[in-house]
Interface confidence: low
């Protein structure tokens, strides 16, 4: 319709889009309205992602990896919107996408760089290995490689072991810290710089408690305000360590405000819970109740671990009977 000389070649534009694994994203592209619209999306300048012309999609040559995963905003094409809706992105989708748009008066080429990140909620675990005590910060699936930092009593620790397993699409990372014999508080931060997402794990050891048999013990567990947001879903778990493994005494889910108690002598104060105080009582203590008690408050953004050591001693009566 128009001689080639009238075509306007606009310099390449480049945008960066950050997507999250398995979620849907939009690769943006806009153009000046015109008739006879042709839209071609290509990956790395060779793989056909999506083609549209003569008023409809033409996907005969679409690369199989994009089958049923792409669509345009058909009602907005006449308004100059050539953006691509992209379903269920994977790490293999990372790279440069080129959008070629031709109309009767103009040809433009836009470049979009797609970066994909993964950040499955990390966890902080407290483990006993023989006579040693370890804190382990771990994340099952993360991409790109995260930044992990440890602090002891709010002071950064340079020693930082990282056990890393790389798979095709992400990393699995464990960062253990030996805290044997320490009464300090510890903090571990895992940061995904691409997704601008940070998770923090905090561990605090409370002073040991000495109790007599048949007495009751009250163990405190209150979140640190810096991390805690009562509007965000979280879970509180109280557990007791016996012979190296933790058994769950009770847990609370904020989403349903449900409390599940597995130990009949355990009690939680509903009013305190409403004030975000998860301290617990354990009644009628016996000698086998001696050990470590762990309160775990966890959300998508943090894990707060509070540990109490309880020593239950025989009462005078029991001692005199023996």
């Amino acid at each position: 319709i128009f001689p080639l000389a009238f075509f306007i070649y606009v310099p390449m534009n480049e945008q960066i889009v950050i997507g999250r694994l398995d979620e849907d994203i939009i690769l943006p592209s806009s153009f000046e309205r015109g008739s006879e619209v042709v839209i071609h999306w290509k990956y790395q300048d060779s793989y056909k992602v999506h083609s549209y012309y003569k008023g409809s999609d033409h996907l005969e040559s679409q690369d199989p990896r994009y089958a049923n995963r792409t669509s345009l905003f058909y009602n907005e094409i006449q308004n100059g919107n050539a953006s691509l809706f992209f379903r269920r992105v994977s790490l293999l989708d990372e790279g440069i996408y080129t959008c070629y748009v031709g109309t009767a008066i103009q040809v433009i080429t836009n470049k979009v760089v797609l970066k994909v990140g993964v950040f499955l909620t990390p966890v902080m675990k407290y483990e006993k290995r023989n006579t040693n005590s370890f804190l382990i910060c771990s994340v099952l699936s993360v991409y790109p490689r995260p930044i992990i930092t440890w602090k002891m009593d709010n002071t950064p620790i340079s020693e930082n072991n990282m056990e890393e397993t790389g798979s095709l699409d992400s990393f699995s990372i464990n960062s253990p810290l030996n805290i044997t014999g320490s009464n300090s508080s510890y903090e571990c931060t895992i940061e995904n710089s691409l997704l601008k997402q940070t998770w923090t794990g905090r561990w605090t050891m409370k002073d040991g408690l000495h109790k007599m048999q048949s007495e009751h013990v009250s163990l405190s567990c209150q979140p640190v305000n810096d991390y805690f947001s009562p509007n965000q879903d979280f879970k509180v778990t109280w557990s007791r360590m016996k012979s190296g493994t933790f058994s769950v005494l009770a847990y609370y889910l904020s989403s349903s405000q449900n409390t599940i108690i597995n130990e009949s002598r355990f009690s939680w104060n509903k009013e305190l819970i409403n004030q975000s105080d998860f301290s617990m009582n354990l009644m009628d203590l016996n000698l086998s109740d001696s050990g470590e008690y762990l309160c775990n408050i966890s959300s998508d953004e943090y894990t707060l671990l509070t540990i109490h050591t309880v020593h239950v001693e025989p009462s005078q009566e029991t001692a005199s009977h023996n």
Partner: antibody, heavy 120, light 107 residues
């Protein structure tokens, strides 16, 4: 309706060349991927080559790679197969075939075929 | 390259019989599989694509199933006009190989 008409077949000596053509009509040729598939009379189908709708991508069976070239002229609605260094085992009926509209590399229409005989 | 195999290579069945043809890929191909019918002296005809989607105009007695490496073409009630050779074809990536074919005739 879709019509695919192959031509250019015949008897040729080993080592020589032949060019097959396929004239397409009844559909928008430039919108569809096209294939060449061959069949030794009385035997099975063998996929030979494919070309994308805009000619930007081509793929070949290992048995013909480096010897055969698929091409198209969208302005003439014609598909081609340039066959060089022909071998006796290239003897077959050569079909031109069109992609199904919503498909990826499988065909919904076939030509009647043209016979290529490679013999000394 | 991925190899395609079909079984049986030929079969005879009576009119009205249920007939099953199997196609196996040497590696997973998701559901990128098509089935074709070629009657004697005719060109092939597309029956099924995407492993189980019936091409328009194909009788409903034909059905396809499977995903990954194992696929099946079933004719629920064999008719005289179904005498033909049946081919499977993978189309996930080049080369877009056909199976060796299964010849079906009437007892």
């Amino acid at each position: 309706q879709v019509q695919l008409v192959e031509s250019g077949g015949g008897v040729v000596q080993p080592g020589r060349s032949l060019r097959l053509s396929c004239a397409a009509s009844g559909f928008t040729f430039s919108n569809y991927g096209m294939h060449w598939v061959r069949q030794v009379p009385g035997k099975g189908l063998e996929w030979v080559a494919v070309i994308w709708y805009d000619g930007s991508e081509k793929d070949y069976a290992d048995s013909v790679k480096g010897r055969f070239t698929i091409s198209r002229d969208n302005s003439k609605n014609t598909l081609y197969l340039q066959m060089n260094s022909l071998r006796v085992e290239d003897t077959a009926v050569y079909y031109c075939a069109k992609d199904l509209i919503s498909g990826i590399y499988y065909v919904d229409h076939w030509g009647q075929g043209t016979l290529v005989t490679v013999s000394s | 390259d991925i190899q395609m195999t079909q079984s049986p290579s030929s079969l005879s069945a009576s009119v009205g019989d249920r007939v099953t043809i199997t196609c196996r890929a040497s590696q997973g191909i998701s559901n990128y599989l098509a089935w074709y019918q070629q009657k004697p002296g005719k060109v092939p005809k597309l029956l099924i694509y995407a492993a189980s989607t019936l091409q328009s105009g194909v009788p409903s007695r034909f059905s396809g199933s499977g995903s990954g490496t194992d696929f099946t073409l079933t004719i629920s009630s064999l008719q005289p006009e179904d005498v033909a050779t049946y081919y499977c074809q993978k189309y996930n990536s080049a080369p877009f190989t056909f199976g060796p074919g299964t010849k079906v005739d009437i007892k």
